[in-house]
């Protein structure tokens, strides 16, 4: 089980002559919805047939009138995801329709009126649990650039979530037989659920509720050894009774690989080893073609004429990978300036300016001095983008409107008393010590260590600090 | 239109040197970053040098100490020194630039590419 989403990023004009009219007016404004219909495999996009993988149906986007005289821009488009469940396993190919549909808010008799705009449908190959494909497809004049991908809802995971994770119980490793669930290394791929008391050890099951036994064992929960003496067959399903093999059915027999793949035992199964063109648990899914337009972002493909043959895509500058689906990290090359983060959004870069940054680039400086004023005789300083008032004595704050308090601070030592001042603060110091803070002791015989009191100013009387 | 030009691939023997320039020309206002970027048959495309947007200068460390990039702004060129060369070099190279156009929107373009290839 899983789900596909659909981000449609665009909704206008295509390139080249021939603008399309713009689908809302002032007389009529209106706004659009998405309509997306998925198939498995590579089937006929006929808009008639059932959408067996899923449908979905977005949100109405935001009213849009036309500005008159104005060419028809990029359509306003609704919030979020197209959202489409699946509930078996993802088919690897698959094809789809995404409508454009305009619905009209004008004084229609009976409601807002409908009506389609673009239709645009295509066939293409896709993992679960891969990024997200980024597509730009033309119907008429108008364009439609949009990104997909299919994800497993846990405990799904694999390319087709079919396999299942749970959280690992012991922190180094999986149990046995367990592997580690790629790419969740911390998750191990989660048993199916048995039959209730199906043995853990000699019992196993491909579909839930069934409980197959390993070789060795027999019996409605596989808790029966196989006494082998009495017996000729050396393998198969047993009878709970006699605790003998007998032939039965292996996971081979009848061959469950379609498209002439050959199938091997699995201790716990079977694998299907399938021709070329073909791929899927049991080579169920048919290969892709040229044809399929399996090259993404503009790639061209080459070879790939019939199913037998590969297609090799050749990508675009900026893209790559096998279907040309992943855009070349364009922000390793580091185009914002100041420290400004870079994002790849696809369609452009952008760039996250830090403080005091902006531009496109983050190539300007903001002035943050510019129109802030400091008060009480402040000058601004400049720095890192946050601007800072130097405030004139007596005043402090972010922008100096506060009246600082001088004796705060507790300049005066020495047990020395702090009075505010209008220029500044005075100590009156203890007796014993003299100095504009009180940081010189006074000797016994009337001289100071350092500088003397200046005249006419006895050591205990207050000093005004400047 | 902005086009970016690359010349100066070729074929050359392990310890062998290429420079490589990249002429970029059209509605450009200003370069921003510029480098260049490699792609191995079946490999991932990757940054081998560029100048930043803050004119820094990065390199990949597979190429620190054996390739150099430089520019000429009059020219709007860029150019990559590659000395030392080895099998692994082997690639088509390709120019990249962040340009400010005039209408002062920024564009990210590529250039077609140039092959290197290092074999005895």
């Known amino acids: 089980a899983g789900v596909f989403e659909l981000q449609i990023h665009s909704f206008g004009p295509g390139p080249g002559p021939g603008a399309p009219r713009s689908p809302c007016s002032a007389r009529l404004p209106c706004r659009l919805f998405f309509r997306v219909c998925l198939k498995p495999g590579l089937s006929e996009e006929a808009a008639e047939s059932p959408c067996a993988l899923g449908a979905a149906l977005s949100a109405r986007g935001p009213v849009y009138t036309e500005q008159p005289g104005a060419p028809a821009p990029d359509l306003p488009l609704p919030d979020g995801l197209l959202q489409v469940p699946f509930r078996d396993a993802w088919p690897g190919t698959f094809s789809f329709i995404i409508e454009t549909w305009r619905e009209e808010l004008g004084d229609q008799i009976g409601g807002p009126a409908w009506s389609l705009l673009a239709r645009v449908a295509g066939r293409r190959r896709l993992a679960a649990g891969g990024p997200w494909a980024r597509d730009i497809q033309r119907a008429g004049a108008w364009e439609l650039r949009f990104s997909y991908r299919a994800r497993c809802e846990p405990p799904a995971v694999g390319t087709a979530c079919t396999r299942l994770c749970r959280p690992r119980s012991a922190p180094s490793r999986c149990g046995p037989g367990l592997r580690p669930c790629a790419p969740l290394e911390d998750e191990c791929e989660a048993p199916l659920v048995c039959r209730a008391g199906c043995s853990p050890e000699h019992g196993f099951c491909e579909q839930p509720g069934e409980c197959r036994c390993l070789e060795g064992w027999t019996g409605p929960l596989c808790t029966v050894p196989v006494s082998t003496s009495s017996c000729l067959s050396p393998r198969g399903p047993s009878s709970a009774t006699t605790g003998c093999l007998v032939p039965g059915p292996g996971p081979c027999d009848g061959n469950p690989c379609a498209n002439g793949g050959s199938c091997s035992e699995t201790p716990r199964s079977f694998e299907c080893t399938c021709p070329r063109g073909f791929y899927g648990l049991r080579c169920e899914v048919s290969g892709v073609t040229c044809a399929d337009g399996p090259c993404f972002n503009g790639g061209l493909c080459v070879g790939g004429a019939d199913p037998d043959s590969a297609y090799i895509c050749h990508c675009p500058p900026g893209f790559q990978g096998s279907n040309c689906e992943k855009r070349v990290d364009r922000c390793s090359l580091q185009p914002c300036r100041n420290g400004g983060l870079c994002l790849d959004l696809g369609h452009a870069l952008r760039c996250r300016c830090r403080a005091g940054f902006a531009g496109p680039r983050c190539e300007h400086d903001l002035d943050d001095c510019a129109g802030r004023a400091c008060a009480n005789g402040g000058t601004c300083v400049e720095g890192g983008g946050a601007h800072r008032c130097s405030c004139a004595l007596g005043f402090g704050g972010r922008d100096c409107r506060e009246r600082a308090d001088p004796c705060a601070a507790r300049p005066c030592a020495h047990g020395g008393r702090c009075y505010a001042h209008f220029s500044g603060l005075v100590c009156a110091c203890a007796p014993g010590y003299m100095g504009a803070r009180c940081e010189f002791p006074v000797h016994p015989d009337g001289a100071s260590a350092l500088p003397a009191a200046p005249p006419g100013l006895r050591p205990g009387d207050p000093q005004r600090y400047l | 239109e902005v086009q970016l030009v690359e010349s100066g691939g070729g074929e050359v023997q392990p310890g062998g040197s290429l420079r490589l320039s990249c002429a970029a020309s059209g509605s450009i206002f200003s370069s921003n970053a510029m480098g260049w970027y490699r792609q191995a048959p079946g490999k991932q495309r990757e940054l081998v040098a560029g100048?930043?947007?803050?004119?820094?200068?990065i390199y990949a460390e597979s190429v620190k100490g054996r390739f150099t990039i430089s520019r000429d702004n009059a020219k709007n060129t860029v150019y990559l020194q590659m000395s030392s060369l080895r099998a692994e070099d082997t690639a088509v190279y390709y120019c990249?630039?962040?340009?400010?156009?005039?209408?002062?929107?920024?564009?990210?373009?590529w250039g077609q590419g140039t092959l290197v290839t290092v074999k005895p």
């Open positions: 990249a630039a962040d340009v400010q156009l005039f209408s002062r929107d920024y564009e990210f373009y």
């Open positions: 100048f930043t947007g803050d004119t820094n200068t």
